[in-house]
Amino acid sequence: MGSSHHHHHHSSGLVPRGSHMSITGISPITESLASLSTYNDQSITFALEDESYEIYVEDLKKDKKKDKVLLSYYESQHPSSESGDGVDGKMLMVTLSPTKDFWLQANNKEHSVELHKCEKPLPDQAFFVLHNRSFNCVSFECKTDPGVFIGVKDNHLALIKVDYSENLGSENILFKLSET
């Protein structure tokens, strides 16, 4: 699937809904086009099937072009863990859009990651806390479900619960972003 991102304007962000994290600004601080792959260098690809998009984790043939995703970065407040209502610094959140008007979303009930067509303001499920990891990798934590990350399960993207004190280095939640 091609990534047509011209006229792709992310001009308004999230309207906070009493969630545990709030987006500071209504527009992204920056945007970037990048291909997404797993720690083991499998590509994340998107295909239109029966009028909906499917997400695949697969080995790409050498000559096949990688699908690009538009990452929109937002500055966000991190809540104080003690009081719950105070602010404990800043963090970066992202939305991921592989094609115009479609965004990756967390489906916490099904523990799945899905592509949905949406309008602004985007729902909370479309926002992920971006974590900077070793080995030039990142992780994506659900805004709506702290401790739950996008991961790879059975060659698909899924939501995976992570125990901070043990598995933050789990390879199945590590992803590579490449701008080339």
């Epitope: 500055e75 404990d88 610094g89 900077n132």
Partner: antibody, heavy 119, light 111 residues
């Protein structure tokens, strides 16, 4: 309130050892990457070492590799820096720092503890 | 390693004046589309304080008179109107890659 309090600094002879501690409070310690940054008297800042949340990864500046070890005890909300084979050039104020949530920048700093290596 | 060079070494200004501090990196500090360049303020006898992260975003509780700009290798910290408490040393720092490095600092002193 988020707080980092360093201790363990002092005067030590060249070749000696010292262990610095950093007691953290006011946040979920295990969720954050932690680092040590030092500042020699009258000089600039130098990153020393980092340990990720979950104790998975550690990184060091070349000048301390093999001599310093960063570690953490999440049950005690404490960060450590074990310093062996100390040299005069290790003399500095050592700051404990916490990354922001997501590990993109040093966000919270302790007051520092002074380590003096001298005979 | 990425070397950060700050200029000027010292800036002598009066309260109310505009301060412009520069930081140049030996190579791009961009990663994932983000400029991973941060600014810190340090006063004598105190630890550094985060002012700006990712080139242009203010840290928690940082007044609006502080702003950051730039991308790639060239970055600027601007203090729009100096307050008495702003006279301090300012450091830039890159978090693109290990070893994380700091500039040598710019001292903003009262003229």
């Amino acid at each position: 309130e988020v707080q980092l309090v360093e201790s363990g600094g002092g005067l030590v002879q060249p070749g000696g050892s010292l262990r610095l501690s950093c007691a953290a409070s006011g946040f979920t310690f295990s969720s954050f990457s932690m680092s040590w940054v030092r500042q020699a008297p009258g000089k600039g800042l130098e990153w020393v070492a980092t340990i990720s949340g979950g104790k998975t990864f550690t990184d060091y500046v070349d000048s301390v590799k093999g001599r310093f070890t960063i570690s953490r005890d999440d049950s005690k909300n404490t960060l450590y820096l074990q310093m062996n084979s100390l040299r005069a050039e290790d003399t500095a104020v050592y700051y404990c720092t916490r990354a922001n949530y997501g590990n993109w920048f040093f966000e919270v700093w302790g007051q520092g503890t002074l380590v003096t290596v001298s005979s | 390693e990425i070397v950060l060079t700050q200029s000027p070494a010292t800036l002598s200004l009066s309260p109310g004046e505009r301060a412009t501090l520069s930081c140049r990196a030996s190579e791009s500090v961009a990663k994932y589309g983000l400029s991973l360049l941060n600014w810190f303020q340090q006063k004598p006898g105190q630890p550094p304080r985060l002012l700006i992260f990712a080139a242009s975003n203010r840290g928690s509780g940082i007044p609006a008179r502080f702003s950051g700009s730039g991308s790639g290798t060239d970055f600027t910290l601007t203090i729009s109107s100096l307050e008495p408490e702003d006279f301090a040393v300012y450091y830039c720092q890159q978090s693109k890659e290990v070893p994380f490095t700091f500039g040598q600092g710019t001292k903003v002193e009262i003229k």
